[in-house]
């Protein structure tokens, strides 16, 4: 019986050009985690494997950093990064647990642009 639960950062937002940490935590189970996959919709972003460590998909290597912990850091965000992200925990003996995070990447506000280029 699968007793565990995945806690995630839920719905989050970040600014275009910035970075964000995607974080999931598996709790309420003594199942041992053997691998964690991170995916954006159907695209695999990264894998953290018990034996092999981290593997970042080649197409995301420049913008995805492993960690902290089993989390994932997305950098140089674009509006196209808006969408659903999934953490998939492969465990023994329970099986697979999946957590969902929705990320919205926002254009920088006009006010902030104004402040940034203000003449002293």
């Amino acid at each position: 019986m699968m007793t565990g639960t995945i806690e995630t950062t839920g719905n989050i937002s970040a600014e275009k050009g910035g970075s964000i940490i995607l974080q999931c935590h598996l709790s309420s189970t003594t199942a041992q985690v053997t691998q964690v996959n991170w995916a954006q919709q159907d695209q695999l972003l990264a894998i953290c494997n018990a034996d092999l460590g981290w593997h970042i998909s080649p197409s995301f290597k420049d913008r995805v950093a492993p960690g902290p912990g089993l989390g994932l850091t997305l950098q140089s965000l674009t509006v196209n990064d808006t969408g659903e992200y999934f953490c998939i925990y492969h465990t023994y003996p329970d099986g697979t647990y999946t957590g969902r995070i929705f990320l919205e990447v926002l254009e920088s506000s006009v006010a902030e642009h104004g402040a940034r280029f203000q003449i002293p």
């Epitope: 053997t34 691998q35 018990a50 960690g67």
Partner: antibody, heavy 119, light 113 residues
């Protein structure tokens, strides 16, 4: 160089309480899971508590569940073990040990601190 | 709980001899999805804390001399020291990290003749 230094051991009466500490240095403490493992006077090794990297998950064997509490302060690079309702069979050397994420063996151990439970 | 049994409990050998010690688990430590055996070996020298030698049953930890070899799968595991040195005087423990609670064998004490 990885260093784990335990402290807080001593002589306690049965039913008493004690808190052990483990100061970590030489590595990114918050990136590792941690455990406490004890060695009995008969030299047997027993795992007694586990905490995940961010402190979200803790696990204990039935022998100490409800009596021992593991915690960590990642800002201070310190691991703790709060022990209560102590019994004579808890007498042991207590080691803190580091675990790589998703790997549950112990890759570094401290030098240990001794707990004696006796009236 | 998984019970780990080690044999012999002690043995005495001369420097240069080959040594084999065994560790048996009460259930398989092989995880089918990654074909890894969740077993580690530790060395504890007199007055010191345990030191990791082998993990995944056969992977030598960085810095461990190649005279130490781990083998086996499922429930039967072996630690071999190909040519014993005086500094190998220690107690050797196996540990399963396949499932909670993690458990250790009782140890094999290696003495030098």
């Amino acid at each position: 160089e990885v260093q784990l230094v335990e402290s807080g051991g001593g002589l306690v009466k049965p039913g008493g309480s004690l808190k052990l500490s483990c100061a970590a240095s030489g590595f990114a403490f918050s990136d590792y899971d941690m455990s406490w493992v004890r060695q009995t006077p008969e030299k047997r090794l027993e795992w007694v508590a586990y905490i995940s990297d961010g402190g979200y998950n803790t696990y204990y064997p039935d022998t100490v569940k409800g009596r021992f509490t593991i915690s960590r302060d990642n800002a201070k690079n310190t691991l703790y073990l709060q022990m209560s309702s102590l019994k004579s069979e808890d007498t042991a050397i207590y080691y803190c040990a580091r675990q790589i994420l998703l790997r549950y063996y112990f890759d570094y151990w401290g030098q240990g601190t001794t707990l004696t439970v006796s009236s | 709980d998984i019970v780990m049994s080690q044999s012999p409990s002690s043995l005495a050998v001369s420097v240069g001899e080959k040594v084999t010690m065994t560790c048996k688990s009460s259930q398989s430590l092989l995880y089918s999805s990654n074909q890894k055996n969740y077993l580690a070996w530790y060395q504890q020298k007199p007055g010191q804390s345990p030191k990791l030698l082998i993990y995944w049953a056969s992977t030598r930890e960085s810095g461990v001399p190649d005279r130490f070899t781990g083998s086996g799968s499922g429930t039967d595991f072996t630690l071999t020291i190909s040519s014993v040195k005086a500094e190998d005087l220690a107690v050797y423990y196996c540990q399963q990290y396949h499932s909670y609670p993690w458990t250790f064998g009782g140890g094999t004490k290696l003495e030098i003749k």
